[in-house]
C-alpha cells in the first residue's frame, strides 16, 4: 500500500480579523494509526494549535467528525481570528507509540495572513502655538493593521501636502503594523479656520480611507496690529483716544493704558468682533481731560496677547492746541486716559 501523505491543498489563505479561518488537511491512508496535530510555525519554537487526542483548544473546531472510523479529513476552523494568528500552519500525522506518539509526516503548510484594519488616524500638532510664516510639524499615527502595505496622504484644506516623512513599523515581519508620519506646514494669517487632514488607505478599508484631522486654530497665534487715533468730542476740554486692536487670534488679550509711562488702566478683552478669517478685533477708548494737563501727554496702548511679550503704540497728545483744532487723522498711537472709557 502507498505510504500515507498529508495534503494541505491551500498554500495560503487570507482572512479578515474577527472572522473564522478554515485550514484544510486530508490524509491519503488510515495507516499508520495515530493522531493528527496542528502546529503554527516550524522548528523548536512551533506552537501547538490543536491536538486530536488531548488538550483544550477553545477557538478550534474540527470540520469533520474525527470519531468516525474512516475519517481522513482533519481540517480545522479557528474562530475570531486576530493579527496574532498569522503564520504558517502545519497538519502533522503522528504514529502511535509507547509511551509517546512519534511524528510521522507533515503537510506542506498553509500560510494564514490576517487582514486587520488600521485604527483611526490620530493627528497631533505642536505643543506651543506658532505665528504665521513659521513652519510647524504635525504627526499622524495609526496602528494594528495588516498586511503591511498602506498609503498615507496629508492635506491642508483639501490641498495635498508634499513635505512629510512616513515610517511603517516594524521593518521586519510582524503580526500587525503601525504607521507614523510627520508633515511640515507653513502657517499663514488666514489659517485660523484651516484644517490639516491625515488620510490612510488600506486594503481592508474597501477604498474608503480613514481620516484624522487637526484644526490649525489649536496651533496658530496671529499677533494683533495696533492703531491709536484721537477725535475731538463735544466738550471743548476733552479728547477721545481709541486703541484699535485688529486681526488677532486667539482671544486672550489684555490691554494697558499708560500716561507718560504710568499705568492708568488695565482691561481684558471682552466684547470682540470676529472677522471672516476667524481673527478678532477689539477697541479700547478713553476720554482725556486736556484741561487737567499743563504739558503734552504721551499716551501708550500696551497689549499683551496670549501670554506673549507686550506690544505697544504711543501717541503724543498736544495739550497747548485747542481740541477742536486737532483733526481725527493725527499720528496713530495708543492713548491713556485719566477718565473712564465711554
Amino acid at each position: 500500500e502507498e505510504e500515507l501523505q498529508v495534503i494541505q491543498p491551500d498554500k495560503s489563505i487570507s482572512v479578515a480579523a474577527g472572522e473564522s479561518a478554515t485550514l484544510h488537511c486530508t490524509v491519503t491512508s488510515l495507516i499508520p494509526v495515530g493522531p493528527i496535530q496542528w502546529f503554527r510555525g516550524a522548528g523548536p519554537g512551533r506552537e501547538l494549535i490543536y491536538n486530536q487526542k488531548e488538550g483544550h483548544f477553545p477557538r478550534v473546531t474540527t470540520v469533520s467528525d474525527l470519531t468516525k472510523r474512516n475519517n481522513m479529513d482533519f481540517s480545522i476552523r479557528i474562530s475570531n481570528i486576530t493579527p496574532a494568528d498569522a503564520g504558517t500552519y502545519y497538519c502533522v500525522k503522528f504514529r502511535k507509540g509507547s509511551p509517546d506518539h512519534v511524528e510521522f509526516k507533515s503537510g506542506a503548510g498553509t500560510e494564514l495572513s490576517v487582514r486587520a484594519k488600521p485604527s483611526a488616524p490620530v493627528v497631533s500638532g505642536p505643543a506651543a502655538r506658532a505665528t504665521p510664516q513659521h513652519t510647524v510639524s504635525f504627526t499622524c499615527e495609526s496602528h494594528g493593521f495588516s498586511p503591511r502595505d498602506i498609503t498615507l496622504k496629508w492635506f491642508k484644506n483639501g490641498n495635498e501636502l508634499s513635505d512629510f516623512q512616513t515610517n511603517v513599523d516594524p521593518a521586519g515581519d510582524s503580526v500587525s503594523y503601525s504607521i507614523h508620519s510627520t508633515a511640515k506646514v507653513v502657517l499663514t494669517r488666514e489659517d485660523v479656520h484651516s484644517q490639516v487632514i491625515c488620510e490612510v488607505a488600506h486594503v481592508t478599508l474597501q477604498g474608503d480611507p480613514l481620516r484624522g484631522t487637526a484644526n490649525l486654530s489649536e496651533t496658530i497665534r496671529v499677533p494683533p496690529t495696533l492703531e491709536v487715533t484721537q477725535q475731538p468730542v463735544r466738550a471743548e476740554n476733552q479728547v477721545n483716544v481709541t486703541c484699535q486692536v485688529r486681526k488677532f487670534y486667539p482671544q486672550r488679550l489684555q490691554l494697558t493704558w499708560l500716561e507718560n509711562g504710568n499705568v492708568s488702566r488695565t482691561e481684558t478683552a471682552s466684547t470682540l468682533t470676529e472677522n471672516k478669517d476667524g481673527t478678532y478685533n477689539w477697541m479700547s477708548w478713553l476720554l482725556v481731560n486736556v484741561s487737567a494737563h499743563r504739558d503734552d501727554v504721551k499716551l501708550t496702548c500696551q497689549v499683551e496677547h496670549d501670554g506673549q511679550p507686550a506690544v505697544s503704540k504711543s501717541h503724543d497728545l498736544k495739550v497747548s492746541a485747542h481740541p477742536k483744532e486737532q483733526g481725527s487723522n493725527t499720528a496713530p498711537g495708543p492713548a491713556l486716559a485719566s477718565a473712564a472709557p465711554l
Epitope: R46, E47, L48, G97, V102
Partner: antibody
Framework: EVQFQQSGTVLARPGTSVKMSCKAS????????MHWVKQGPGQGLQWIGA????????TYNQKFKGKAELTVVTSTSTAYMEVSSLTNEDSAVYYC???????????????WGQGTLVTVSA | DIQMTQSPSSLSASLGERVSLTCRAS??????LNWLQQEPDGTIKRLIY???SLDSGVPKRFSGSRSGSDYSLTISGLESEDFVDYYC?????????FGGGTKLEIN
Amino acid sequence: EVQFQQSGTVLARPGTSVKMSCKASGSTFTSYWMHWVKQGPGQGLQWIGAIYPVNNDTTYNQKFKGKAELTVVTSTSTAYMEVSSLTNEDSAVYYCTRSFYYSLDAAWFVYWGQGTLVTVSA
Amino acid sequence: DIQMTQSPSSLSASLGERVSLTCRASQDIGSRLNWLQQEPDGTIKRLIYATSSLDSGVPKRFSGSRSGSDYSLTISGLESEDFVDYYCLQYASSPFTFGGGTKLEIN
C-alpha cells in the same frame, strides 16, 4: 530520571575537527529537540543550534552555520555535534540541553548535560 | 536577533540580603524567558521558566517577574549557595539568546 551524559574532555589541534556526543536517558528521545550551547572561557552562553531526532530537521544560529554540524542516532538516543576547522576561538565548554517537540514553556532547557570541554592548541 | 541585556554583570551582597537581577529584551518576547543558575563546576540548572514559574525543587526565595521589556530575578534572603552565576534566556524566537550573565559575589 532524565539525564544527559556528555563525552569527555578533548584536546585538539587547530584545523582539525572534533565530534562530541550527548546520550539521553529517562524519556522518549524522539519527542524532543536536542540543543547545543557554547560557553567560551570566562564568557557567557551562546546557542549553537538544535536537531529534531524524528526527521533530522536542524536549525542553526547563523554564527555557527558551517562550523557546527548536528546529527542524531535515534536507536541509541544519542545526539552528536561535530565542530570543524578548529581555531582558538572554538576552545569552550559545549553543553547539550533539550526542548519539547513544540514550544511548551515548562519543557524549555530544563535538563542540561555536564558539558564537554574542548581545548584547541598547537 | 533578540538581544538580552543583563545587569548588573557582577554584584556583591551579604547573606540574608535581597537582590534583583534584570534582563532587558530588545524585542517583544512575551513571557518566554528562563532564568538559569550555573555552579562554579559548570553545572547548569533552570530556576524559573515562563518569566515567573518556579521549577520544582527550587527554593521559594527565588522569584521571577516582568515589567514591560524588563525581566527580573529576585532572591530574597541570600544563602551561601546562591553566590554563583545567573543567566537569562529567551526562547521566543530563534536564534535563542542569553543575557551576558551576572556573577553574584559574597560581601
